[in-house]
């Protein structure tokens, strides 16, 4: 395969540039991201000395993707700066393959193997230098660049320490064989951020898991701050194309955030799918089920294609605080299927949350424990109390008449009423479990337009002598 690719390298022409000369390695010294023109090339040791390449330090290779502009975009500048700030002694190399990336998408895709081989050859050459170790190499590829990194890891003699795929490109890579895309076999640790996956239309980012751990912020699709509402206001972007760019590029900014906001690390939680995560089922850190994201992701044994999820803010710092809420709804009447809208406000030692809606993913289970996911942008500190509100919903005259008749026959219980004795909460970030109880055990009922207050009554979830209230069904 290598010989074949070598031949391709020698003969392939892309516009005015021969493919062999179409990849440049732009070594960025810490003299500032504006410094230009320190290029590395295989067999030429002088630039390594001139630009003070540190053989024993970590080495990052940043690999861009397809481009329509023919220039290296600002995300790259931000990523270089962030890496240099976080890892002051590290070598940062930008892989410039603009001649092959500034083409039709299909042509750029067909060039990814050649570019990957070129990166591998650079790494092979560097391995011959005293002190240089492949284990210290971290390839960071965005979009098509993620697959380039995969090919580089596949072709290099030995094993690269880490590859980070930042929203690896989807078209022409989705569902293909592991040797034709980024895969866990390409490095000792492959971590991936998926931010633009779509199950309908074209998915710019790959949907399938392709690393050891695959992190899907906000389910991997609709990123906060990138919606049409946000962009039409022209706060950050102005067109549909810019919405796409915003969501696709969010992976890069999450990675940058993990470098610069060390004190505000985001955590992702293992889950089988986005829906289960939205239900709040997956906030466990047991058995390596949670991990840092971006630069802070850690290799865990025996994980492969592990899907992980988290919620984020709309901008840096992206960190939010996740809470699992377990609520048992007791129903004293067979009210049929109800679709209530619940809101909670969390009160902590540091702050109180905004009014948070409880997302009902499927349907409320009556006389059953329901699990919800809520998240706050601010650190509330230790939770003290919770206000639960059932939003009054507009109903037909017939519904109101039925309720009025029901009230006449049984004045003490409106038909649309539920009873909640306690709320159990688990913090994703601290893994702490708390139980919140109603103040008066006799006043546990809630109806549309009403609110219930719950106060911290226990650390942990297990209650002594728990007994279920008698359920009256009529």
């Amino acid at each position: 395969a290598e010989e074949q690719l070598e031949g391709g390298l020698r003969t392939a022409k892309d516009g005015p540039a021969a493919a062999k000369a179409a990849v440049r390695f732009h070594f960025r010294t810490s003299k500032g991201p504006e410094r230009e023109g320190c290029y590395l090339s295989v067999g030429h040791s002088q630039p390594l000395e001139d630009c003070s390449f540190n053989m024993t330090a970590k080495t990052f290779f940043i690999i861009h993707g397809w481009t329509m502009s023919g220039m290296l975009e600002n995300w790259l500048h931000k990523l270089v700066s962030a890496l240099q700030m976080r890892e002051k002694d590290a070598n940062v190399v930008v892989v410039d393959w603009l001649p092959l990336a500034h083409q039709l998408y299909t042509d750029a895709v067909n060039s990814t193997r050649v570019v990957g081989l070129s990166v591998a050859k650079m790494l092979d050459w560097l391995q011959g230098k005293d002190g240089f170790s492949l284990g210290n190499v971290h390839l960071i590829g965005y979009s098509l660049g993620a697959h380039v990194a995969g090919f580089a890891g596949n072709f290099v003699k030995g094993t690269v320490g880490r590859i980070t795929g930042l929203d690896p490109a989807g078209p022409m890579f989705e569902g293909v064989d592991i040797h034709r895309r980024l895969s866990p076999d390409d490095a000792d640790f492959v971590d991936v951020l998926h931010t633009y996956t779509r199950s309908f239309g074209i998915s710019i980012g790959i949907q399938m898991p392709v690393g050891h751990i695959d992190i899907y912020p906000n389910g991997g699709d609709f990123q906060p701050g990138c919606g049409l509402n946000d962009v039409l206001g022209s706060i950050a972007y102005g067109t549909i194309a810019e919405v796409v760019k915003c969501e696709h590029e969010r992976a890069v900014h999450l990675f940058v955030d993990s470098l610069v906001n060390q004190d505000k690390p985001s955590f992702a939680f293992q889950c089988t799918d986005s829906n289960r995560f939205k239900k709040g089922i997956c906030l466990s850190c047991r058995k390596n089920r949670c991990n840092g994201i971006g630069y802070n992701a850690k290799k865990t044994r025996n994980k492969r294609n592990t899907k992980m999820y988290l919620k984020t803010r709309a901008g840096m710092p992206f960190r939010v605080y996740h809470y699992q809420m377990k609520i048992h709804f007791f129903s004293y009447k067979s009210v049929g299927a109800i679709e209530p809208t619940f809101y909670v406000t969390l009160y902590g030692t540091n702050a109180e949350s905004q009014v948070l809606s409880l997302e009902i993913v499927e349907q409320i289970g009556l006389n059953a424990t329901n699990t919800f996911l809520v998240y706050t942008e601010e650190d509330l500190g230790d939770l003290l109390k919770i206000k639960l509100t059932w939003e009054g919903t507009s109903r037909s005259w017939y519904d109101l008449w039925r309720e009025f008749r029901s009230y006449l026959s049984q004045p003490h219980r409106p038909e649309r009423e539920l009873s909640i004795r306690r709320i159990r909460v688990k913090s994703g970030e601290t893994q702490r479990r708390l139980t919140f109880c109603v103040e008066d055990p006799e006043k546990t009922s809630i109806a549309p337009g009403q609110e219930l207050w719950f106060y911290k009554c226990r650390d942990g979830w297990r209650m002594k002598n728990e007994t279920s209230p008698t359920v009256e069904l009529s």
């Epitope: 991201p33 504006e34 230009e36 023109g37 220039m71 975009e73 600002n74 603009l98 102005g238």
Partner: antibody, heavy 120, light 107 residues
Framework: EVQLQQSGPELLKPGASVKISCKAS????????IHWVKQSHGKSLEWIGH????????NNNEKFKDKATLTVDKSSSTAYMELRSLTSEDSAIYYC?????????????WGQGTTLTVSS | DIQMTQTTSSLSASLGDRVTISCRAS??????LNWYQQKPDGTVKLLIS???KLHSGVPSRFSGSGSGTDYSLTISNLEREDFATYFC?????????FGSGTNLEIK
């Protein structure tokens, strides 16, 4: 010392075409991109487009898509901009400017400008 | 396209004065803001890149600041050679766009 030397002033008739040159010296020509900027009389600056001399890739402002064609000759470290179907609206000073390969790089060195006058 | 607005088209000042020229972007440009000086003979020079980074050879009396959509160029202790036109330019999004310019003249 980085220098961008542009060709001299041009006086042309409507409908004609013109090719303005920008010769670079004092740095490695392929390490930076060359951009072209228009300044109409007494007005602001407008970005026309750029060329990456390393491989000849170009990108134009939509407004100038059908007006300007950018090329380079690597052997002489010279960038060219051809303007076609000239009208009086094209009368302006045209600058070439050097920029790194990053969006974020500024236009760090400029040519002295080429004055184009289109008149019948 | 991102609109760059320099509200003050002309500014009069005396030698030794301190002047501030402002520039506003129609949307957040993430500090990708550059300042240029154009002399009456048409010569254009880079002064400041990335909001506040002084280009080599530019006197330290020039400084830049700002964030989001609002940026400014300050010249302290004006000298004779500083009387010129100043343009801001955003490097955040294609097409790159410039402000309309502020002409600084001697009072």
């Amino acid at each position: 010392e980085v220098q961008l030397q542009q060709s001299g002033p041009e006086l042309l008739k409507p409908g004609a075409s013109v090719k303005i040159s920008c010769k670079a010296s004092g740095y490695t020509f392929t390490d930076n991109t060359i951009h072209w900027v228009k300044q109409s009389h007494g007005k602001s600056l407008e970005w026309i487009g750029h060329i990456n001399p390393y491989y000849g890739g170009t990108n134009n402002n939509e407004k100038f898509k059908d007006k300007a064609t950018l090329t380079v000759d690597k052997s002489s470290s010279t960038a060219y901009m051809e303007l076609r179907s000239l009208t009086s609206e094209d009368s302006a000073i045209y600058y070439c400017a050097r920029k790194g390969i990053y969006y974020s790089s500024p236009f760090d060195y400029w040519g002295q400008g080429t004055t184009l006058t289109v008149s019948s | 396209d991102i609109q760059m607005t320099q509200t003050t088209s002309s500014l009069s000042a005396s030698l030794g004065d301190r002047v501030t020229i402002s520039c506003r972007a129609s949307q957040d440009i993430n500090n990708y803001l550059n300042w240029y000086q154009q002399k009456p003979d048409g010569t254009v020079k880079l002064l400041i890149s990335y909001t506040s980074k002084l280009h080599s050879g530019v006197p330290s009396r020039f400084s830049g600041s700002g964030s989001g959509t609002d940026y400014s160029l300050t010249i302290s202790n004006l000298e004779r050679e500083d009387f010129a036109t100043y343009f801001c330019q955003q490097g955040n999004t294609l097409p790159f766009t410039f402000g309309s310019g502020t002409n600084l003249e001697i009072k």
